[in-house]
Interface confidence: medium
Amino acid sequence: KSPIFGPEEVNSVEGNSVSITCYYPPTSVNRHTRKYWCRQGARGGCITLISSEGYVSSKYAGRANLTNFPENGTFVVNIAQLSQDDSGRYKCGLGINSRGLSFDVSLEVSQGPGLLNDTKVYTVDLGRTVTINCPFKTENAQKRKSLYKQIGLYPVLVIDSSGYVNPNYTGRIRLDIQGTGQLLFSVVINQLRLSDAGQYLCQAGDDSNSNKKNADLQVLKPEPELVYEDLRGSVTFHCALGPEVANVAKFLCRQSSGENCDVVVNTLGKRAPAFEGRILLNPQDKDGSFSVVITGLRKEDAGRYLCGAHSDGQLQEGSPIQAWQLFVNEESTIPRSPTVVKGVAGGSVAVLCPYNRKESKSIKYWCLWEGAQNGRCPLLVDSEGWVKAQYEGRLSLLEEPGNGTFTVILNQLTSRDAGFYWCLTNGDTLWRTTVEIKIIEGEPNLKVPGNVTAVLGETLKVPCHFPCKFSSYEKYWCKWNNTGCQALPSQDEGPSKAFVNCDENSRLVSLTLNLVTRADEGWYWCGVKQGHFYGETAAVYVAVEERKAAGSRDVSLAKADAAPDEKVLDSGFREIENKAIQDPRLFAEEKAVADTRDQADGSRASVDSGSSEEQGGSSR
């Protein structure tokens, strides 16, 4: 499919001008290559009319120009003094005319309306309001006032001052007679339809002395604004329909076959399933304007979108509307990243988030999409060191690996963490990506105690058991804080006995805290990584208390509270992969400290988007 995009149809009137914008992916090659506008012949081929290399056909001499805007990835063709001969099929493109890097444009130039003398022209957008003013003389002040529409050869009464209203205009028309000082009546038509366009005649009086005024009403279907966005990127539709519909339900719909327009989202709470997790309808301002953000753009999102206002929350005849034609460029600068990440209850996920590498100093954010009402995405963590209170100790945003990617780690997973999350920065708003976290059946791979109590002035040793599948990974311990997780020295204690059917490649790596102080209290993570790419993590909370009896502590798995959704058996046994195993160190006298922390706020359900781009979390 060609990545060039422009308007499919351009309509104008003889004598007028048009401006046609064509979009292309702004690669360095494309920015500098030839741009052209050509007319398609009946037998194929495409005859150049104007190009960026200075060529202008004699047909366009003195009335056309082509301007390239390489920084935007657009070029614009302006054509003036249009005639009906200019109607036809054209292409705007890059390179050689026959190469296929082009977009088909249909230009239709119609004859201007043949208007009677003294005709007032009203040009109004579809769905809006028109006021037709009709002057009259004093002698007709008390006589009947009326408005007719010319249908074929005959005038048809639309409204009059005796109370008649044509059924086609019921509920959306009124006739106002100004105060005695002004010799004027006006007809106001709301929610204009395309069928309202035409010639009108207003009249005061019915005899030969009546006053008449001709009006030509042109109802404009909104020209769609062209929007060119990258696959996997994001688009924002800004919809400003005016204060007169500030209190009317708003909608965004996508045109399907014919005149159907399927609701994508509306302010009445409707949202199309295909946009679950990746759409927000932002609140209206007092003037009735609103915006819709869609992330994770897919090929199938391309098409014509309309925003509008109607009490039903969907497109109806007479709805005021705005239109966009969205083109999704498959030659995307936004790299592929997993759209689904899987983790197990009690385990962890590490999510890779792409950003525009030109903006390495931008603030990075991670937020949780919530579908309630019109959708919102409250922030959970940012790269400035803010972490939402309920996520302290289990969420971290790391600038690594850098160069266009940052990492978010979330551990101590529960079923409530299932949902959609957005990666974004305060820089390029097009780089908003969505990832769905799914919680699947399974056990966490890393085994750590639950909460641990250390004694002031003593030594604490905390174990982390790594199964053999992580034999080639770097293993680490770190202390969590709101800006990241600071690495700590750890000791490899040899093979772990915590895994069934696991050979000598399993590992027990311990964190040792010597001469414990109050400052040692907090969250500690053990984890695996390969270079700057992070894998699974497990978290332990270390509490610090006053000395009761001398000695050092060697904490074992039995001191753990159960990870969420996991059972701890009596007599110091922990059930791992449905097989109870016994560790010789499980019988230390220390009791576990209860963990009552808030794992996450709110309850969320997972929605399976059926994506094939999946990344494993704690288990496959």
Epitope: Q373, C377, L379, N426
Partner: nanobody, 130 residues
Amino acid sequence: EVQLVESGGGLVQAGGSLRLSCAASGRTFRSYAMGWFRQAPGKEREFVADISWRGGRLYYADSVKGRFTISRDNAKNTVYLQMNSLKPEDTAVYYCAATGDQPAFTTAQGMGAMLEYDYWGQGTLVTVSS
């Protein structure tokens, strides 16, 4: 749990200035975004300004832009609202509020509806006479 206490309200001439303070108790103050709201007699409560946890991101209602300034001092657990060029229509009870969410982010990033504030003060009355 965060408790909020506003002070600094009072009677002032049109064109004058006032500085409202909101003292918060609770060790997690620094991780909360703070906002000021106001409610004029017989009207709904309306948003005035909010500030992110570190004070780097600010957001103002159009009606107060350029006249009011929100700031915070995390060491003192206090958020301020400096009100200059006061007008009679600024007369209202001013409330301080705190949220564990980050509304300055939400609004600036187009991330959805104004967020729910978890904690509210009792309010302080500001009267601007003409």
